[in-house]
C-alpha cells in the first residue's frame, strides 16, 4: 500500500484527479525525479543561446552560447560576448588591456603582469596585452658556484683528435 504519488517515476507527475494516478509529462515539460506533483516547463534555448541537449521527459534542455559568446553562471544562465585576447569586456564593449596588464583568453578581465622582482627574479620575456611576462632566473642563480642546470662537458683525453 505504498503511496502511489511518491512512487510516480521520473517523466511522470501525480495527476491523481484523473483515471490514472501517474500521467506522462506533457510535451515540452519534464520531471527529473520521482514523486513530482507537477512537471517543469522545459528550458528554451533562444536568441544568443543554442540547444546543446534537447529536453526529454526526464531531463531539462541544456543550452550553450552561439559562436562569439561564452556561458556564464550555473547551467549557462547567461551568455557574454567574447573579446579578443588582449582585451576585456566593459560596459562599452571590448577594450584593449591597459599597459601592464594582459588577458590570454577570450573572456574575463585583464590581469597585471607578474612582478618578477617580488620573487627576486629578472624579466626574461617582456609582457604583452596577450601574454604575461616570463620571469628569468634570479641574479643569485647566475653567480659563480651556483649549481648549473647544464652539466659540464666531459674533458677530452690528450693525444686524440676527432676522426
Amino acid at each position: 500500500l505504498q503511496d502511489p504519488c511518491s512512487n510516480c517515476p521520473a517523466g511522470t507527475f501525480c495527476d491523481n484527479n484523473r483515471n490514472q494516478i501517474c500521467s506522462p509529462c506533457p510535451p515540452n515539460s519534464f520531471s527529473s525525479a520521482g514523486g513530482q506533483r507537477t512537471c517543469d516547463i522545459c528550458r528554451q534555448c533562444k536568441g544568443v543561446f543554442r540547444t546543446r541537449k534537447e529536453c526529454s521527459s526526464t531531463s531539462n534542455a541544456e543550452c550553450d552560447c552561439t559562436p562569439g559568446f561564452h556561458c556564464l553562471g550555473a547551467g549557462c544562465s547567461m551568455c557574454e560576448q567574447d573579446c579578443k585576447q588582449g582585451q576585456e569586456l566593459t560596459k562599452k564593449g571590448c577594450k584593449d588591456c591597459c599597459f601592464g596588464t594582459f588577458n590570454d583568453q577570450k573572456r574575463g578581465i585583464c590581469r597585471p603582469w607578474t612582478n618578477c622582482s617580488l620573487d627576486g627574479k629578472s624579466v626574461l620575456v617582456n609582457g604583452t596585452k596577450e601574454r604575461d611576462v616570463v620571469c628569468g632566473p634570479s641574479p643569485a642563480d647566475l653567480s659563480p658556484g651556483a649549481s648549473s642546470v647544464t652539466p659540464p662537458a666531459p674533458a677530452r683525453e690528450p693525444g686524440h683528435s676527432p676522426q
Epitope: 500500500l1 505504498q2 503511496d3 502511489p4 504519488c5 512512487n7 491523481n16 494516478i21 520521482g34
Partner: antibody
Framework: SLEESGGDLVKPGASLTLTCTAS?????????MCWVRQAPGKGLEWIAC????????PHYASWAKGRFTISQTSSTTVTLQMTSLTAADTATYFC??????WGQGTLVTVSS | AQVLTQTPSSVSAAVGGTVSISCQSS???????FSWYQQKPGQPPKLLIY???TLASGVPSRFKGSGSGTQFTLTISDLECDDAATYYC????????????FGGGTEVEFK
C-alpha cells in the same frame, strides 16, 4: 499508532461507520491512509485509500465504490462509511498508513 | 479488476532451510509498486518488502524480494521458527479504481 473503532453486529442492509484514530500522526499533513479487511479465516482484501490533508481523489476497489466511502473527518481521524451491508462484509477491518503502520482492527459482523 | 495469484497456498519447511513464494499479476504492476507482508494469527499484517525489493525497516536480510512486471518472488532463507506465518503479496496499479490488489496468501509452517 492507529486504532480502529465502530465495529459492531448489524443486520443485513444496515449502514455502519468505522473510525481510524491516529496518535502522534497529524492528518492535516499528507499521508496515504487505507482500509483493508479480512474475513474470518480468509486473506486480505483492499478496500480504499485516501490522501489526508488533500483534496485528491480517493482510490477504491471497484467492488467497494458506491457502497463504501473513505474520508478524513478531522486532523486525527479517517472514516469508512459502509452501506447496504451483507453477510459477505463480515470481517476484521484494518486501517493502515502507507502499508507500514497498521491498527489492530475492528470486527464487523453482519447477521440477521 | 487486477488478480494476484500467489503460489503455493501453503508450504512446509525445515528450520534453516529456504522457501520461495511466487506472485503473478494479471496486469503489469506499475513502477515496481509491489510489497510483501507477513501476518501472524490475531495480528495485523507487517510490511516486509516494498518497491519489489527494498527491505522495510527492522526486517532481517534473510527476506529477499525480487521480480518486476507481472512476476514477483519472496525468498526466505535460513528459516527460523518465528517465520511461521501467512505471507501476502500486494501489487499497485496506475488507476484510481482497483489501485491495489492482494494475493491469496501463503502459509509457511514447519515440519
Amino acid at each position: 499508532s492507529l486504532e480502529e473503532s465502530g465495529g459492531d453486529l448489524v443486520k443485513p442492509g444496515a449502514s455502519l461507520t468505522l473510525t481510524c484514530t491516529a496518535s502522534g500522526i497529524d492528518f492535516s499533513r499528507r499521508y496515504y491512509m487505507c482500509w483493508v479487511r479480512q474475513a474470518p479465516g480468509k486473506g486480505l482484501e483492499w478496500i480504499a485509500c485516501i490522501y489526508t490533508g488533500s483534496r485528491d481523489t480517493p482510490h477504491y476497489a471497484s467492488w467497494a465504490k458506491g457502497r463504501f466511502t473513505i474520508s478524513q473527518t478531522s486532523s486525527t481521524t479517517v472514516t469508512l462509511q459502509m452501506t447496504s451491508l451483507t453477510a459477505a462484509d463480515t470481517a476484521t477491518y484494518f486501517c493502515a498508513r502507507e502499508g507500514s503502520l497498521w491498527g489492530q482492527g475492528t470486527l464487523v459482523t453482519v447477521s440477521s | 479488476a487486477q488478480v494476484l495469484t500467489q503460489t503455493p497456498s501453503s508450504v512446509s519447511a525445515a528450520v534453516g532451510g529456504t522457501v520461495s513464494i511466487s506472485c503473478q499479476s494479471s496486469q503489469s504492476v506499475y513502477s515496481n509498486w509491489f510489497s510483501w507482508y507477513q501476518q501472524k494469527p490475531g495480528q495485523p499484517p507487517k510490511l516486509l518488502i516494498y518497491s519489489a525489493s527494498t527491505l522495510a525497516s527492522g526486517v532481517p536480510s534473510r527476506f529477499k524480494g525480487s521480480g518486476s512486471g507481472t512476476q514477483f518472488t519472496l525468498t526466505i532463507s535460513d528459516l527460523e521458527c518465528d517465520d511461521a506465518a501467512t505471507y501476502y503479496c500486494a501489487g499497485g496499479y496506475n488507476t484510481v479504481i482497483d489501485t491495489f490488489a492482494f494475493g491469496g496468501g501463503t502459509e509457511v509452517e514447519f515440519k
